[in-house]
């Protein structure tokens, strides 16, 4: 058993039929010695008396809020949560496996630049009685500070008869050095509590590996005289690291016809302009990627040829 926060404790249980469970001793936080009784949740049934209560925790029915009383007055509470281990593996019931980029990916994180600011998100089908707490650091043995905000519900999607909920959190490395080579990864730890179930999820990454620039901005077309060609121009996104001479992007320019089956013409360039043939009813799209490190491409910025 360990303390998650004040008066909230996590009991780690091997979860299998007829498992013996864990013996837990609760102590009433009071100077009183006599006349103390214990109850669980809203029940008025007295579970025991005395300053300590010894219980065998085997299942969710044994978890909950234990309260010690004296003469009708509440003295203190202890909330017991369960963390299930099945076949040696901690349960992952609360979050959905996003399966990207690989199986057992519960947390996904992205950064728009090298400032040390990043966003992580996760999915669940659970809509109520659910709390998240996020901690982060760079390195684990001698951790350097990363500050994370509160997790918030960022999207709700309908999947058949069920809804799926996306939560996200923003974190900022306290003393980020954008130009430095990373040697220790960022660690992100999410505590999830649904009713009386506790689970924890972790992700470890280098900022360079989770970079995904915003799409190029100010995408414009300039027709070239007496030609089917146009000059496409764009700018670095505002959120990208500066100076651009050091934090450079490379770009992919794509001409796509109205039909998805039509052949796509693609041009790769390090410049912020390119000349392409603009077909009728086609659209021109541009996306960006770090020039020197193959992390994710940005989403496309698009304009119609017409």
């Amino acid at each position: 058993i360990w303390e998650l926060k004040k008066d909230v404790y996590v009991v780690e249980l091997d979860w299998y039929p007829d498992a013996p469970g864990e013996m837990v001793v609760l102590t009433c936080d009071t100077p009183e010695e006599d006349g103390i009784t214990w109850t669980l949740d809203q029940s008025s049934e007295v579970l025991g008396s005395g300053k300590t209560l010894t219980i065998q925790v085997k299942e969710f029915g044994d978890a909950g809020q234990y309260t010690c009383h004296k003469g009708g007055e509440v003295l203190s509470h202890s909330l017991l949560l369960l963390h299930k281990k099945e076949d040696g593996i901690w349960s992952t019931d609360i979050l959905k496996d996003q399966k990207e980029p690989k199986n057992k990916t519960f947390l996904r994180c992205e950064a728009k630049n090298y400032s040390g600011r990043f966003t992580c998100w996760w999915l669940t089908t659970i809509s109520t009685d659910l709390t998240f707490s996020v901690k982060s650091s760079r390195g684990s043995s001698d951790p350097q500070g990363v500050t994370c905000g509160a997790a918030t519900l960022s999207a709700e999607r309908v999947r058949g008869d069920n809804k799926e909920y996306e939560y996200s959190v923003e974190c900022q490395e306290d003393s980020a050095c954008p130009a430095a080579e990373e040697s220790l990864p960022i660690e992100v730890m999410v505590d999830a509590v649904h009713k009386l179930k506790y689970e924890n999820y972790t992700s470890s990454f280098f900022i360079r590996d989770i970079i995904k620039p915003d799409p190029p901005k100010n995408l414009q077309l300039k027709p070239l005289k007496n030609s089917r060609q146009v000059e496409v121009s764009w700018e670095y996104p505002d959120t990208w690291s500066t100076p651009h001479s050091y934090f450079s992007l490379t770009f992919c320019v794509q001409v796509q016809g109205k039909s998805k089956r039509e052949k796509k013409d693609r041009v790769f360039t390090d410049k912020t302009s390119a000349t392409v043939i603009c077909r009728k009813n086609a659209s021109i799209s541009v996306r960006a990627q770090d020039r020197y490190y193959s992390s994710s491409w940005s989403e496309w910025a698009s304009v119609p040829c017409s």
Partner: antibody, heavy 116, light 108 residues
Amino acid sequence: SVEESGGRLVTPGTPLTLTCAVSGFSLSGYTMIWVRQAPGEGLEWIGIISSSGNTYYASWVKGRFTISKTSTTVDLKMISPTTEDTATYFCARGSGAYISDYFNVWGPGTLVTVSS
Amino acid sequence: FELTQTPSSVEAAVEGTVTIKCQASQSIDSWLSWYQQKPGQPPKLLIYSASKLAPGVPSRFSGSGSGTQFTLTIGDLECADAATYYCQSYYDVNAGYGFGGGTEVVVV
């Protein structure tokens, strides 16, 4: 205690509001649920309203009902009733432990008949 | 999400025992309650958290199970136990909520 009212005979498409009046406890501490039971059938949950006023509906509801509350009442509005909505409608109070809760205080029910 | 109750009807003698099963289509941990309903009356809570007896309910009623399989057992049957019994999942309103189809208990 909780008590439903407002059930009556209505023609299809006529909106109807059922009211659940509560006494002896505050709605700010409990989830409330509306459940219905067609004649000779089982219990079917319609939706709940949490202590903070958030509403959640069964997937089949699809905008056919809305739940709201005041300090002492919980309303179920039937937007455009059909004959399939003929049932006894129950209001019940949760235990107070959770939003998705079990229900330990039930009203006697109010009968809604939808017929032309 | 589905809660399947079996059997739909059961007949048993006074002082006998009845067992009703409730199966969830996904794990709901122990977030299951049982209700008794008599004709013309609202449901009455018997069991919550799969196995905890509601206040004032005789100990002849007991609940067990977790995950997807749950059981309500009524021992030492009395005529007053003739009713329809429903299980209810309250895991989450989106990811596992609702009532089973009901089991009618006839006491002979």
